[in-house]
């Protein structure tokens, strides 16, 4: 489907508003440190150029690829070398190497100030004064902090962001209306970013086949009534969409995502009975709704899997002649029967099945060799079931904050070399699995918990990749995508770790802790907990609990004191001394 001018084609397909928004997202995800005004200028220049190409597709440079056009534009930034250092060397390369170079320099943890939410009245004034700039700024700030955010989905978030301000800035109590909506968008946005980051990591680190396998399993669970050929078509199209977005081809990605939503809605009868409501919505809502749609009911009377995958005389022939199709069918058939399994478990089962066939098919009696293959699945299924049961019991016993602390201690002992902010962030997120998933019935716990943990552990993997400090993290992150969680679960205390030198400054606190939100105060305490474990990795749960209880009491006491700062200074010294004694430091 060749077009004389790719930029004109995408401009016409997407419309000016979406075109501009997507170019802004693309530029902000590449040049994460550039000021907003610079990006707006570049976007306007690209948009004006696109309009000339719409008017005349044969005009000069209109035949150039989007990577060439966008890359040339990014390389006009005057401060590229001083702001980005070696990323400026990308500009000496030709496409496609130049785009690959820009992609490699995307920073998952950019050194950007925390986004501070202004007063509601200030935000509403800014929104009314210049709605377009206000919304562009939202796209820019999210995109630069989340360089892999799923661009068409960010357009959906921006639409909801606009709707929140439109509604709430007219409300009697603006804050009561707006703040919960903004909190919800923030939390959903972080979750969406992390989920997409896993998709991109899957494609970039483990290849297209790994992503396709994930997609076959997930779509088969979601659309169990759809035929294998239909699921395969959706997987191929979905893979193209995510490959494009992860590769920075945001215009193509958004365009293809819209086409996929259109196809799904036109063919919902052969896909799922749950799509009706989604398909009545406008484009952005429709695509989001389809992505989140609940699993359809399983067809009644599905035959046993053994007939085609164990008992058939053609098992080995089918495997050898077309592994992708045969193993894809196995995964499809298993997944549609098991909405109660996590996707990663289904992928482990498929891998076990594949390994067994590879081992058995050349044997003298292949059938005898692989006849008991399904028995090998039992321990693989029981392992996450037992782990989730244990951890949900612990969560129900402790509550979220203390459950997070238990995980902080557990993971700091496993990988103490990892930076404290990363351990705090990742363990807090791991701990959220409790409130997110433990409330579900048994049949929904595993897909909720283990697939969520895959997303969180991927955050650890991408943050660690930027500054690798632990061979154990590298090993768990790179060896197998589907075995990351079991790999981390299996890690014991790192006996090779040399405890960190004690530094009193780390445990010195000031009155400013009293004005922090409950969440920020928790983070401060959890940071101290990680540091404690790094100093004393062999400390028992009881010792750590005693110190943390003393610490909580100390903060509470000093925050009630008249002279808070003096209290923190004097009581802090006592606390440090008592803690050192309690831990034998």
């Amino acid at each position: 489907d060749a077009h004389k001018s790719e930029v004109a084609h995408r401009f016409k397909d997407l419309g000016e508003e979406n075109f501009k928004a997507l170019v802004l997202i693309a530029f902000a995800q590449y040049l994460q440190q550039c000021p907003f005004e610079d990006h707006v200028k570049l976007v306007n220049e690209v948009t004006e150029f696109a309009k000339t190409c719409v008017a005349d597709e044969s005009a000069e440079n209109c035949d150039k690829s989007l990577h060439t056009l966008f890359g040339d534009k990014l390389c006009t930034v005057a401060t590229l070398r001083e702001t980005y250092g070696e990323m400026a060397d990308c500009c000496a390369k030709q496409e496609p190497e130049r785009n690959e170079c820009f992609l490699q320099h995307k920073d998952d943890n950019p050194n950007l100030p925390r986004l501070v939410r202004p007063e509601v009245d200030v935000m509403c004034t800014a929104f009314h004064d210049n709605e377009e700039t206000f919304l562009k700024k939202y796209l820019y700030e999210i995109a630069r902090r989340h360089p892999y955010f799923y661009a068409p989905e960010l357009l959906f978030f921006a639409k909801r962001y606009k709707a929140a301000f439109t509604e709430c800035c007219q409300a009697a109590d603006k804050a009561a209306c707006l703040l919960p909506k903004l909190d919800e968008l923030r939390d959903e946005g972080k979750a969406s970013s992390a989920k997409q980051r896993l998709k991109c990591a899957s494609l970039q680190k483990f290849g297209e086949r790994a992503f396709k396998a994930w997609a076959v399993a997930r779509l088969s669970q979601r659309f169990p009534k759809a035929e294998f050929a239909e699921v395969s078509k959706l997987v191929t199209d979905l893979t193209k969409v995510h490959t494009e977005c992860c590769h920075g081809d945001l215009l193509e990605c958004a365009d293809d995502r819209a086409d996929l939503a259109k196809y799904i809605c036109e063919n919902q009868d052969s896909i799922s009975s749950k799509l009706k409501e989604c398909c009545e919505k406008p484009l952005l809502e429709k695509s989001h709704c389809i992505a989140e749609v609940e699993n359809d009911e399983m067809p009644a009377d599905l035959p046993s899997l053994a007939a085609d995958f164990v008992e058939s005389k053609d098992v080995c022939k089918n495997y050898a002649e077309a592994k992708d199709v045969f193993l894809g069918m196995f995964l499809y058939e298993y997944a549609r029967r098991h909405p109660d399994y996590s996707v990663v478990l289904l992928l482990r089962l498929a891998k076990t099945y594949e390994t067994t066939l590879e081992k058995c098919c050349a044997a003298a009696d292949p059938h005898e060799c692989y006849a008991k293959v399904f028995d090998e699945f039992k321990p693989l299924v029981e392992e996450p079931q037992n782990l989730i049961k244990q951890n949900c019991e612990l969560f129900e016993q402790l509550g979220e904050y203390k459950f997070q602390n238990a995980l902080l201690v557990r993971y700091t002992k496993k990988v103490p070399q990892v930076s404290t902010p990363t351990l705090v962030e990742v363990s807090r997120n791991l701990g959220k699995v409790g409130s997110k998933c433990c409330k579900h019935p048994e049949a929904k716990r595993m897909p909720c918990a283990e697939d969520y943990l895959s997303v969180v552990l991927n955050q650890l993997c991408v943050l660690h990749e930027k500054t690798p400090v632990s061979d154990r993290v590298t090993k768990c992150c790179t060896e197998s995508l589907v075995n990351r969680r079991p790999c981390f679960s299996a890690l014991e205390v790192d006996e090779t770790y040399v405890p960190k030198e004690f530094n009193a400054e780390t445990f010195t606190f000031h009155a400013d802790i009293c004005t922090l939100s409950e969440k920020e105060r928790q983070i401060k305490k959890q940071t101290a907990l990680v540091e404690l474990v790094k100093h004393k990795p062999k400390a028992t749960k009881e010792q750590l609990k005693a110190v943390m209880d003393d610490f909580a009491a100390f903060v509470e006491k000093c925050c009630k004191a008249d002279d808070k700062e003096t209290c923190f200074a004097e009581e802090g010294k006592k606390l440090v001394a008592a803690s050192q004694a309690a831990l034998g430091l």
């Epitope: 050898a320 592994k323 199709v325 066939l357 050349a362 044997a363 003298a364 292949p366």
Partner: antibody
Framework: EVQLLESGGGLVQPGGSLRLSCAVS????????INWVRQAPGKCLEWIGI?????TTFYATWAKGRFTISRDSTTVYLQMNCLRAEDTAVYYC???????????????WGQGTLVTVSS | DIVMTQSPSSVSASVGDRVTITCQSS???????LSWYQQKPGKAPKLLIY???KLTSGVPSRFKGSGSGTDFTLTISSLQPEDFATYYC???????????FGCGTKVEIK
Amino acid sequence: EVQLLESGGGLVQPGGSLRLSCAVSGIDLSNYAINWVRQAPGKCLEWIGIIWASGTTFYATWAKGRFTISRDSTTVYLQMNCLRAEDTAVYYCARTVPGYSTAPYFDLWGQGTLVTVSS
Amino acid sequence: DIVMTQSPSSVSASVGDRVTITCQSSPSVWSNFLSWYQQKPGKAPKLLIYEASKLTSGVPSRFKGSGSGTDFTLTISSLQPEDFATYYCGGGYSSISDTTFGCGTKVEIK
């Protein structure tokens, strides 16, 4: 000592047929997969096909129809029909590493037998 | 069509040198089904590495295989006199019928 020994090579006219043998000693052939691989003078290695322990065979796409692999208790055969000049090569038999069925891991090789197709 | 490209086609090196040979596959190989063979004149090939990075028993640790998907590398960290030979990569794919070898890299004495 485990050995694979090819025989049956020689000069053959275009359009002719030839049957190569691979005698296996030192192991029970009924437990292993055996491949045929060829190498034209100064050229690449080229996989021809495989016979599994069960007797099931698979061939390279280009080899289907003209080449047939079979076996008895101690020998694996490669029947070659409608031979052409471009089939001139050293033909090797090789064992697939035990524990694999479709992977290109061949740990034991014969010394090869030269087939020359020429008028 | 399956294409397996080895580069360089030949390399001249001295004893003690580090030598790197690459193998590019299109499409990607199945499940890291990638092997490396060494062949000396008049002899049969010898399996060095399987599953892209696993050393066959008895192969010296100076041989190292790496890579995944479409791009693979064989590195000889410190070339020894007995390492002068031709090296081939072999790839397995979704269909066994597509089993393919690269066309070799000849490592010669400088």
